[in-house]
Amino acid sequence: MKVLQEPTCVSDYMSISTCEWKMGGPTNCSAELRLLYQLVFQSSETHTCVPENNGGVGCVCHLLMDDVVSMDNYTLDLWAGQQLLWKGSFKPSEHVKPRAPGNLTVHTNVSDTVLLTWSNPYPPDNYLYNDLTYAVNIWNENDLADSRIHNVTYLKPTLRIPASTLKSGISYRARVRAWAQHYNTTWSEWSPSTKWYNSYREPFEQR
């Protein structure tokens, strides 16, 4: 049994780190492999992650962690039974992928404005809470070429756009993702998308 692509891990900088790797051939990850992880600290335990399949030769493990701090470092050991396949380390603070924003809602009750709101995925005591900026993707359900990205570089998780910038009588979808500038993170996954109907009509004299 051989590791083809070594484990790479990303942390949500809260409680979960996700590690993925590829094996040299088809593998039943949960039956054959174990990923052991331990915080480099004298009295910490070695926890065991039972991986799950991620495609024919891919495996994924979710490591459960304490609230992460910048100096935390974990040792990782990938085992197949009593055979050590790979040994490595992982510093969560250096490989952050934020959680996806949630509760994306579209408010269209203001006549000429579409208001999008969403929730910051972190509690206020988390370091990332005040460091997130967002990208909002809005697209026309019937015309994928009619798609745009709005960068939200302020802290408030809201976006206002004039309804007039969208085609009238068309269904649109929106989704949002986040990243944290000061932690040099990757982008989060996109939030689930939300659909709405743009019923805005231009005033009669402008037609």
């Epitope: 409680s15 949960s30 335990e45 065991t48 992650c49 979710h62 490591l63 459960l64 304490d66 039974g81």
Partner: antibody
């Protein structure tokens, strides 16, 4: 210093109840591990009672003999784990240890306790009339 | 719940002896087995976890082996401070239960 300190032991009459406490210091009792209770009757071996996951999910596991009479709970704000014991019998007389445990997880919701790494000094419970 | 059968229940040995204690699980527990040392009036001390991994600060004369159902604790050269009671602890995947063996008391011959 990382340590666990049990309290609440003492003499209790048969049929009575008692709540033991385990105060954690040097680490957060809400972090990713299990907090467990183990007991040892005088001159006998070690007996696992149960565990509670100290992270956000708070799942519990109990030995089959302990289900119903024994309940483990936690108060993360006080960094404390509790063992509530009801309908006590003479055979429950033992030293009760609190222990921190490693875990095995599959995904983020299937987590179970593994070995006990850090132990308290124990508190003696005597059930007698 | 699983059962853990530990043997012998007691043994007498001299300083310098090689000592072996075995533990058998009633079902396959992979490598989810730990060994503890306990001295009178004290809490147990972790020696080995995952069947063969030495815990922090434990002398290298202690070693563990086995997987599945059969496990062994070996003390390669018994020292005066090793006279104590030893317990195995098996952890069951299927039920989430943890069961101790009955213990082995190592006494001075």
């Amino acid at each position: 210093e990382v340590q666990l300190v049990e309290s609440g032991g003492g003499l209790v009459q048969p049929g009575g109840s008692l709540r033991l406490s385990c105060a954690a210091s040097g680490f957060s009792s809400s972090s990713a591990h299990y907090m467990c209770w183990v007991r040892q009757a005088p001159g006998k071996g070690l007996e696992w009672i149960g565990c509670i996951y100290a992270g956000s999910r708070g799942s519990t596991y109990y030995a089959s003999w302990a289900k119903g009479r024994f309940t483990i709970s936690r108060d993360n704000s006080k960094n404390t784990v509790y063992l509530q014991m009801n309908s006590l019998r003479a055979e429950d007389t033992a030293v009760y240890y609190c222990a921190r445990a490693a875990f095995v997880n599959r995904g983020v919701s299937w987590i179970w306790p593994y070995y006990f790494s850090l132990w308290g000094q124990g508190t003696l419970v005597t059930v007698s009339s | 719940d699983i059962q853990m059968t530990q043997s012998p229940s007691s043994l007498s040995a001299r300083v310098g002896d090689r000592v072996t204690i075995t533990c058998q699980a009633s079902e396959d527990i992979e490598s989810y087995l730990a060994w503890y040392q306990q001295k009178p009036g004290k809490a147990p001390k972790l020696l080995i976890y995952r069947a063969s991994t030495l815990a922090y600060g434990v002398p290298s004369r202690f070693s563990g082996s086995g997987s599945g159902r059969d496990f062994t604790l070996t003390i390669s050269s018994l020292q005066p401070e090793d006279f104590a009671t030893y317990y195995c602890l098996g952890s069951s995947y299927s039920t989430g239960s943890n069961i101790f063996g009955q213990g082995t008391k190592v006494e001075i011959k």
